[in-house]
Interface confidence: medium
Amino acid sequence: VPSIPLDVLSASNSSSQLIVKWNPPSLPNGNLSYYIVRWQRQPQDGYLYRHNYCSKDKIPIRKYADGTIDIEEVTENPKTEVCGGEKGPCCACPKTEAEKQAEKEEAEYRKVFENFLHNSIFVPRPERKRRDVMQVANTTMSSRSRNTTAADTYNITDPEELETEYPFFESRVDNKERTVISNLRPFTLYRIDIHSCNHEAEKLGCSASNFVFARTMPAEGADDIPGPVTWEPRPENSIFLKWPEPENPNGLILMYEIKYGSQVEDQRECVSRQEYRKYGGAKLNRLNPGNYTARIQATSLSGNGSWTDPVFFYVQAKTGYENFIH
């Protein structure tokens, strides 16, 4: 069995593709025949789903390189560090060569140890064809985001609520140390495993994997609200606005913002992910009688979508409607 491929690197060149490069194993133990590349979509961190982004001034910081996303208090100043004896905001101290080497060895050790636990010897599946990624993307995406056909099957759990273990997909790469993985979701973190396989792969299996995490780039327009914004009158000078959520957003939608008004759209309303999940829209209360316009914008992990076209609605002086939602 060959040793693991070396120096796995991945970069995104688009919102749906990842380029993966690596070096051959140091110990091929025979004729190196091919590599198996496996990739798995990673779940979003649970706090992104639980946190109400309308409740506090918190925004996610986007870090492309390692795929992590942190929450930062907008109102706080950046934390200061002591650096070279001086106080004040500054960069981290430069690492010594010894520290860099130690970190590299530590990282390699962690990877090798996880590989050992995860899969000591990888047995390639015979005649396995690479499946269409979009098929699973469609099955695992939020059921609520569909506005043309419903889910293909009922034995799904909405990934919005659970940190789902997504399936692995794989492809075979012959005679090169580079591949492009396509049909990925925008601004989404993936784990990519590379296995080395030699002439005895069918009999003895392939190597354990070396792996890397990488995030696809954001897609232009992915956070735009598709389709029309509709409205319904509510009692007591209120209306209910309803809109479809972006079907394949950059990561996930954190919140929506409504700007509305009668003469100018000078009022703003934040709609949390939790509220949207419950109602599929939002109620605007205490409106004076008259004509109004409203626009809606989604905010995802990668930023803001476009404002929708304006929806025009009116509030009558007195309404005698039946009891409406919230």
Partner: antibody, heavy 122, light 107 residues
Framework: QVQLVESGAEVKKPGESLKISCKGS????????IGWVRQMPGKGLEWMGI????????RYSPSFQGQVTISADRSITTAYLQWSSLKASDTAMYYC???????????????WGQGTTVTVSS | AIQLTQSPSSLSASVGDRVTITCRAS??????VAWYQQKPDKGPKLLIF???TLQSGVPSRFSGSGSGTDFTLTISSLQPEDFATYYC?????????FGGGTKVEIK
């Protein structure tokens, strides 16, 4: 497998109380509206009410307001329909149903329980 | 309260026929209409939601249309398994209402 499993058939006398149940599994129970629908023998469907288990927000049809109580226990992923004093006219099949794939209650009920037959007779 | 009037209450048709069932609301209900099929001694099955969206697994011979107050369920070519009772349902206020049902029988 997403499913709703209702409790078994009940035979009761007028004036008695009753609580029937509907257990959801295979999906995030708290975050989807779940409702109850009545079908009297040989008749059509009647929408009774609906609940959002996450915060117990409940809506009733005017016809059933005050006649029944809808509740849910998130910890055991179960919704309930309750009567404090049954009448002979409550004899019917009762279905629980949820908006899971469609997502929102105003798009309809896409997953249904098998139904619970309630017979009220002296 | 919004009334929902379904028509006809029953109809007789043959296999291969095109069948149309209508549902009229007493006031504008946008596209919040669903259609269900119910066979004897079975629970209802969602066919169409949001007036025109076909539910997964439902044959394409079923289609829905309409917006506002008038809605239609069409079966383009009736099959033996389609003989059943069909209900429309409106859903935009605090409570929902089903139509009275349309029983599709074999001619």
């Amino acid at each position: 497998q997403v499913q709703l499993v209702e409790s078994g058939a009940e035979v009761k006398k007028p004036g008695e109380s009753l609580k029937i149940s509907c257990k959801g599994s295979g999906y995030s129970f708290s975050n989807y509206w779940i409702g109850w629908v009545r079908q009297m023998p040989g008749k059509g469907l009647e929408w009774m009410g609906i609940i959002y288990p996450d915060d117990s927000d409940t809506r009733y049809s005017p016809s059933f307001q005050g006649q029944v109580t809808i509740s849910a226990d998130r910890s055991i992923t179960t919704a309930y329909l309750q009567w404090s004093s049954l009448k002979a006219s409550d004899t019917a099949m009762y279905y629980c149903a949820a908006s899971i794939v469609t997502g929102y209650y105003y798009y309809g009920l896409d997953v249904w329980g098998q139904g619970t037959t309630v017979t009220v007779s002296s | 309260a919004i009334q929902l009037t379904q028509s006809p209450s029953s109809l007789s048709a043959s296999v291969g026929d095109r069948v149309t069932i209508t549902c009229r609301a007493s006031q504008d209900i946008s596209n919040y209409v669903a259609w269900y099929q119910q066979k004897p001694d079975k629970g209802p099955k969602l066919l169409i939601f949001a007036a025109s969206t076909l539910q997964s697994g439902v044959p394409s011979r079923f289609s829905g249309s309409g917006s506002g107050t008038d809605f239609t369920l069409t079966i383009s070519s009736l099959q033996p398994e389609d003989f059943a009772t069909y209900y429309c349902q409106k859903y935009n206020s605090d409570y929902s209402t089903f139509g009275g049902g349309t029983k599709v029988e074999i001619k």
